[in-house]
């Protein structure tokens, strides 16, 4: 730690005195203190001399000596009083700037320690301090206003009693700045705007901040607009509002509008787009395919996006058949507004039944007219299979009918033994029918196909199986010839032979 000579915490001298403060350390040392005139500094290796041969009240202050090379940052200090009967105060600065809730030190230093008992802080022209002003005094440093508030931004004077009369310091202006957390908060209303040519429009750009020092402007396609500004103060915030009123919009008013506000912390901007159209419009679209296929028993949400101006005057979902005249339940229809001009309408179809396949249409109306968007819903079914024995053109034939959607394809299997379903070990022969005959194929219905297997002689200890499958599932039917005739049964059924 450096050592100061004279080795006293405080030194009291008279104006005009010569003052020499010497600091000695292990390495190089540096003096620091309040900036004040008339000092001279001399360095001499590991010592530094701070001196004046004509001390004035302005040299009153605390002088600190540090050793820059000391990792512990040790320092020594001495406080100098230059006791001037005419000048009880040395004011280090005439303006103090702090942020709200910081302590504000008003640096009026007492030039004579004896005067400490009679000091006080006042506002200029002898006005008392504001209520709730919490302050303390240090003869070395001055008056501290604790947790300063914006409202305490005033001009202050330090007062000392000398010979029964109050002697004032020069004034100190305290500026308490509001803590600005960032750039001003912004709103630009509306977020999007559409108007038909000739209609009126309004765009409002507003910014607010805890500090009045901020700028706000509205620009159209990078051109700053000259708009009168309205200012207000509420909820402890300053507000500046720019309102653009357009009585009859035209195409040149369209484009990008940006609301920009800036302060010392930076800049905020937000933008909106203004569209001017020739006439009303109504556009329906869907992100989904308009042709939908869903497995029976499952659910489906049909979604329609609507873009419209002016707003919708009516809308509904309609079932167009072909199975029944039922209409979608209103509780299954849902509307959500994405923004002013875009909406999403959803029809929920849970646990779809066969009778609910068909066409669903969404209709909407605005001053631009009616529009409709139609979905075609086909249900998928796993195949259902049946086999019969018959004679066609005198030949014994197994006839397999398979019904499902999408169209099933058919495979015949011949296997040894009597079984509900042929397994690999039993299979004797396999026939694929690549082109079964389509018996019925109507929109929104199952597709029924028929496959024929001509069998010259039925082997009695064997099973003939028709298998059908599609993307949903598979079905099969086993045919077992019996001496008394023929017996067919679907899989998993108990085979009863009387």
């Amino acid at each position: 730690i450096p050592v100061i000579e004279p080795s006293v915490p405080e030194l009291v001298v008279k104006p005009g005195a010569t003052v020499t403060l010497r600091c000695v350390g292990n390495g190089s040392v540096e003096w620091d203190g309040p900036p004040s005139p008339h000092w001279t500094l001399y360095s001499d290796g590991s010592s530094s001399i701070l001196s004046t041969n004509n001390a004035t009240f302005q040299n009153t202050g605390t002088y600190r000596c540090t050793e820059p090379g000391d990792p512990l940052g040790g320092s020594a200090a001495i406080h100098l009083y230059v006791k001037d009967p005419a000048r009880p105060w040395n004011v280090l600065a005439q303006e103090v700037v702090v942020f709200e809730d910081q302590d504000a030190l008003l640096p009026c230093l007492l030039t004579d320690p004896v005067l400490e008992a009679g000091v006080s802080l006042v506002r200029v022209r002898g006005r008392p301090l504001m209520r709730h002003t919490n302050y303390s005094f240090s003869p070395w440093h001055g008056f501290t206003i604790h947790r300063a508030k914006f409202i305490q931004s005033q001009d202050y004077q330090c007062s000392a009693l000398m010979g029964g009369r109050k002697v004032m310091s020069i004034s100190i202006r305290l500026k308490v700045q509001k803590v600005i957390p960032g750039p001003p908060a912004l709103t630009l209303v509306p977020a999007e705007l559409v108007r038909i040519r000739g209609e009126a429009a309004q765009i409002v750009c507003s910014a607010s901040s805890v500090d009045v020092n901020f700028d706000v402007f509205l620009q159209h396609n990078n051109t700053k607009l000259a708009i009168p500004q309205q200012s207000d103060f509420h909820n402890n915030r300053y507000q500046k509002v720019l309102t653009l009123n357009l009585d009859q919009v035209d195409f040149q008013h369209a484009g990008n509008y940006s609301c920009v506000a800036s302060n010392v912390q930076g800049k905020h901007s937000t933008s909106m787009f203004f569209r001017v159209v020739e006439s009303a419009y109504l556009n329906l679209s869907s992100e989904q395919n308009l042709i939908q296929e869903v497995t029976v028993g499952e659910g489906l949400n049909l979604k329609v996006m609507v873009e419209a101006y002016p707003g919708l005057q009516g809308f509904n979902w309609t079932y167009l058949g072909p199975f029944s005249d039922h209409q979608p339940e209103p509780k299954l229809a849902n509307a959500t507004t994405k923004d002013t001009y875009r909406h999403t309408f959803t029809l929920s179809l849970p646990r779809l039944k066969p009778s609910e396949a068909g066409r669903y249409s969404f209709l909407a109306r605005n001053p631009g007219g009616w529009r409709a968007l139609t979905f075609e819903l086909t249900l998928r079914y796993p195949p259902e299979v049946s086999v019969i024995w018959t004679f066609i053109n005198g030949s014994g034939t197994l006839l397999c009918a398979a019904s499902g959607y999408p169209q099933p394809n058919v495979t015949w299997l011949q296997c040894s033994g009597h079984t509900d379903r042929c397994d690999e070990a039993q299979v004797l022969q396999v026939w694929d029918d690549p082109y079964p005959e389509v018996l019925s194929q109507e929109p929104f219905h199952k597709v029924t196909v028929q496959s024929l297997l001509t069998v010259e002689t039925l082997e009695h200890n064997q099973t003939y199986e028709c298998r059908a499958h599609n993307s949903v599932g598979s079905g099969s039917w086993a045919f077992i010839p019996i001496s008394a005739g023929a017996h067919t049964h679907p899989p998993d059924e108990f085979l009863f032979t009387p």
Epitope: E30, W31, D32, G33, P34, P35, S36, P37, H38, W39, T40, L41, Y42, L50, Y63, R64, T66, L92, A93, Q94, E95, V96, V97, V98, Q102, A104, L105, P107, H141, I172
Partner: antibody, heavy 117, light 110 residues
Framework: QVQLQESGPGLVKPSETLSLTCTVS????????WNWIRQPPGKGLEWIGY???????NYNPSLKSRVTISVDTSKNQFSLKLSSVTAADTAVYYC???????????WGQGTMVTVSS | QSVLTQPPSASGTPGQRVTISCSGS????????VNWYQRVPGTAPKLLIY???QRPSGVPDRFSGSKSGTSASLAISGLQSEDEADYYC???????????FGGGTKLTVL
């Protein structure tokens, strides 16, 4: 060692407020005093003002009505605000550390501010 | 117009000694200490001399300062090409209550 770095917009419009910040690194702002100095193109240095870490300030009388210098000890930064700027305020702006004999021993590298519409 | 007066230019050949003067008044140089700064083009100013005649560490002893009455001077001996720069004097002014600078002297090494 102590280093100073100025930051702020390089272009300011006439009549607006010029705002600069000086960040002190490698040492504490809570000793010494901290200055702003500028140099207009082709001219000499001009002292703008200083702030002592306690928040007390002293400004060049010719600029006093337009200048505010503030300090944020928690961020180790001090700032300059110069209001109602004109083209005459176009300059390289420096921040510098001051010693008690008014010697500026450490300087930032400077930032050029142009006042133009 | 600067409060402190310096010659706008000075020159010398390598190895020569060059002196730059700074003239003030009783409210600045007459009652306060003088500091000198060197500014090489494109860089920030650097403290060269403080408190009339004190050199900060790292400044070569070729640079020296002096003060007499209301004038001060900066002397550079053994001039080198890297000394080509602008030099400014500065002091506190009691009546203006602020720091004042000289107009600067451009030193050219021939």
């Amino acid at each position: 060692q102590v280093q100073l770095q100025e930051s702020g917009p390089g272009l300011v419009k006439p009549s607006e407020t010029l705002s600069l910040t000086c960040t002190v690194s490698g040492g504490s702002i809570s000793i010494y005093y901290w200055n702003w100095i500028r140099q207009p193109p082709g001219k000499g240095l001009e002292w703008i003002g200083y702030i002592y870490y306690i928040g007390s300030t002293n400004y060049n009388p010719s600029l006093k009505s337009r200048v505010t210098i503030s300090v944020d000890t928690s961020k180790n930064q001090f700032s300059l605000k110069l209001s109602s700027v004109t083209a005459a305020d176009t300059a390289v702006y420096y921040c510098a550390r001051g010693r008690l004999t008014y010697a500026f021993d450490i300087w930032g590298q400077g930032t050029m501010v142009t006042v133009s519409s | 117009q600067s409060v402190l007066t310096q010659p706008p230019s000075a020159s010398g050949t390598p190895g020569q000694r060059v002196t730059i003067s700074c003239s003030g008044s009783s409210s600045n140089i007459g009652s306060n200490t003088v500091n000198w700064y060197q500014r090489v083009p494109g860089t920030a100013p650097k403290l060269l001399i403080y408190s009339n005649d004190q050199r900060p560490s790292g400044v070569p002893d070729r640079f020296s300062g002096s003060k007499s009455g209301t004038s001060a001077s900066l002397a550079i001996s053994g001039l080198q090409s890297e000394d080509e720069a602008d030099y400014y004097c500065a002091a506190w002014d009691d009546s203006l209550n602020g720091v004042v600078f000289g107009g600067g002297t451009k030193l050219t090494v021939l």
